[in-house]
Interface confidence: low
């Protein structure tokens, strides 16, 4: 058939691989676009075809599977590079077809260089460790399928540029790196280099991830409202600007949604017929505890507005809290008028 279901360029799968290392790339059709797997497609007589467009070119070319030492090969729904070269960068297309059916998708592949300390343009996954929480582990990612279980690779772990050996609280254990107890000083980039033999050659897989030490769930508390509080009274005259900050501290909680909002007379500000604006700012501590500030602002407050109830609310996975601001209308100071009598002294 002439027609082909073209899923276009799948930029969600921006694949980055290191130069001079093996890479195995699965055709995204079976993972994200079609409801059947490669085995089913193959059994049904469908053929998977690969081609590519070089960087800064428009011309689609077949992939050369006849390179020395089978540098590029295909196995089922996987395209293999053993190893990659810089000029392998480009858009790769996998197409599944027979005489009556066709479906294809393209995806970008970027081959990147790393320096001697593993720095590179590679986007790094972030792994969060709880501070002072006991033993926690990170695992060397994305190495499955590169070698059979009968092959025993050597794995070397680095922090930054340095091989991890004789570190006080960090212990390499094969594919895992164990943190006996995590501190802020453990923040940084950790790299595992997996070395394995294949057909008389030695290959390296380099995987770097960023470790971020965050607040421990043991120390997590419900949101704490620092402002408004009982010590501050917002006393204004009609016509003045009313500014009330709601400042809330949130303990770090993995995957928790932190929310702060104001109510005025029990309603959302949008539902009140007054000209109110709310500006939010967010800051984080070194362990990713969060402080959110929402400043409620009424440019020209009326005496009616000064009688309303202004309540700051906060919610996290640990609970919900609320605190009312004390808002008052300023009592005008008495005006002393001196009336001059006719005489000053007693007559």
């Amino acid at each position: 058939s002439e027609r082909c279901d073209d899923w276009g360029l799948d930029t969600m799968r921006q694949i980055q691989v290191f130069e001079d290392e093996p890479a195995r790339i699965k055709c995204p059709l079976f993972e994200h676009f079609l409801k059947f797997n490669y085995s089913t497609a193959h059994s049904a007589g469908l053929t998977l075809i690969w081609y590519w467009t070089r960087q800064d070119r428009d011309l689609e070319e077949p992939i050369n599977f006849r390179l020395p030492e089978n540098r590029i090969s295909k196995e089922k729904d996987v395209l293999w590079f053993r190893p990659t070269l810089l000029n392998d960068t480009g858009n790769y297309t996998c197409m599944l077809r027979n005489t009556t059916y066709c479906s294809k998708v393209a995806f970008p592949l970027e081959v990147v260089q790393k320096d001697s300390c593993f720095n590179s343009p590679m986007k790094l996954p972030v792994h969060k460790l709880y501070i002072e929480y006991g033993i926690q582990r990170i695992t060397c990612p994305n190495v499955d399928g590169y070698f059979p279980s009968s092959v025993k690779p050597t794995i070397t772990w680095y922090m930054g540029c340095y091989k991890i050996q004789n570190f006080n609280n960090v212990i390499p254990e094969g594919m895992n790196l164990s943190f006996l107890i995590a501190f802020i000083s453990n923040n940084g980039n950790y790299t595992c280099v997996v070395t394995y033999p294949e057909n008389g050659r030695t290959f390296h897989l380099t995987r770097t991830l960023t470790v971020k030490v965050v607040g421990s769930p043991k120390n997590a508390v419900p949101p704490v409202i620092h402002s408004p509080n009982d010590h501050v009274v917002y006393e204004k005259e009609p016509g003045e600007e009313l500014l009330i900050p709601c400042t809330v501290y949130f303990s770090f909680l993995m995957d928790s949604r932190n929310e702060v909002w104001w109510t005025i007379d029990g309603k959302k500000p949008d539902d009140i017929p007054i000209d109110v604006t709310i500006n939010e700012s967010i800051s984080h501590s070194r362990t990713e505890d969060e402080t959110r500030t929402q400043i409620l602002s009424i440019k020209k407050v009326t005496s009616e507005d000064l009688k309303r109830s202004y309540v700051c609310h906060a919610r996290s996975a640990k609970g919900e809290v609320a605190k009312a601001a004390t808002v008052k209308q300023k009592v005008p100071a008495p005006r002393y008028t001196v009336e001059l009598a006719c005489g000053f002294g007693a007559t």
């Epitope: 320096d115 001697s116 300390c117 593993f118 720095n119 070397t156 680095y158 922090m159 930054g160 540029c161 340095y162 091989k163 050996q165 004789n166 570190f167 000083s185 940084g188 280099v193 070395t195 030695t202 390296h204």
Partner: antibody
Framework: EVQLVESGGALVQPGGSLRLSCIVS????????ITWFRQAPGKGLEWVAT???????YYASWAKSRFTISTDTSKNTLFLQMDSLRAEDTAVYYC??????????????WGPGTLVTVSS | QIVLTQSPATLSASVGDRVTITCQAS??????LAWYQQKPGKAPKLLIY???TLPSGVPSRFSGSGSGTEFTLTISSLQPDDSATYYC????????????FGQGTKLEIK
């Protein structure tokens, strides 16, 4: 363009102390691992110590007790404190960027060196 | 402790010659070897890393090969500017390394 420049070399008496500095211009020092090497007159290169800022320090076995490597990341400066100096410590001292440790570590950037002479 | 042994210690060759310097490691260091060039009164300059990779700016007449324990630096066509001392350096073992370098090879132009 990153540059390394050593300073602090001088003539010092045996038993004396000296502090060498290595200023790194360009990106933050904390992004790099810096190593001190030395080269005695007419001799080969000898590793002294390496620092991975905020992570760890490494010393040649002979340097451990007398030399201390440190950094001031705010000033982008690396230091080598040398105590109980001996005549055999006379050498040109180099700082270099890079590290030891993986199968392709190399020192890709070197300072011009600073001369330390230990003599009475 | 890994020891690197370079040979020859000194070498004299003519402009245009093909020159080879070898470096032997006392135990296998995979491809963890770098080569440096040093001219009198100057700092060393990185020529080759990862046994055979040239950094940018290094002339293509320099090449490196080998893995395990035997390594070679080759200058395909010697130039007058190549007169220098050449050092190999292992980047395999960190920690308590007494000396990461070979003893050097002095190359003179005839």
């Amino acid at each position: 363009e990153v540059q390394l420049v050593e300073s602090g070399g001088a003539l010092v008496q045996p038993g004396g102390s000296l502090r060498l500095s290595c200023i790194v211009s360009g990106p933050s020092l904390s992004h790099f691992d810096i190593t001190w090497f030395r080269q005695a007159p007419g001799k080969g290169l000898e590793w002294v110590a390496t620092i991975s800022p905020g992570v760890s320090t490494y010393y040649a076995s002979w340097a451990k007790s007398r030399f201390t490597i440190s950094t001031d990341t705010s000033k982008n400066t690396l230091f080598l404190q040398m105590d109980s100096l001996r005549a055999e410590d006379t050498a040109v001292y180099y700082c270099a960027r890079g590290g030891v440790g993986s199968s392709w570590k190399a020192f890709d950037l070197w300072g011009p060196g600073t001369l330390v002479t230990v003599s009475s | 402790q890994i020891v690197l042994t370079q040979s020859p210690a000194t070498l004299s060759a003519s402009v245009g010659d093909r020159v080879t310097i070898t470096c032997q490691a006392s135990e296998s260091i995979s491809t963890a070897l770098a080569w440096y060039q040093q001219k009198p009164g100057k700092a060393p300059k990185l020529l080759i890393y990862k046994a055979s990779t040239l950094p940018s700016g290094v002339p293509s007449r320099f090449s490196g090969s080998g893995s395990g324990t035997e390594f070679t630096l080759t200058i395909s066509s010697l130039q007058p500017d190549d007169s220098a001392t050449y050092y190999c350096q292992q980047g395999f073992s960190s920690g308590n390394v007494h000396n990461a370098f070979g003893q050097g090879t002095k190359l003179e132009i005839k």
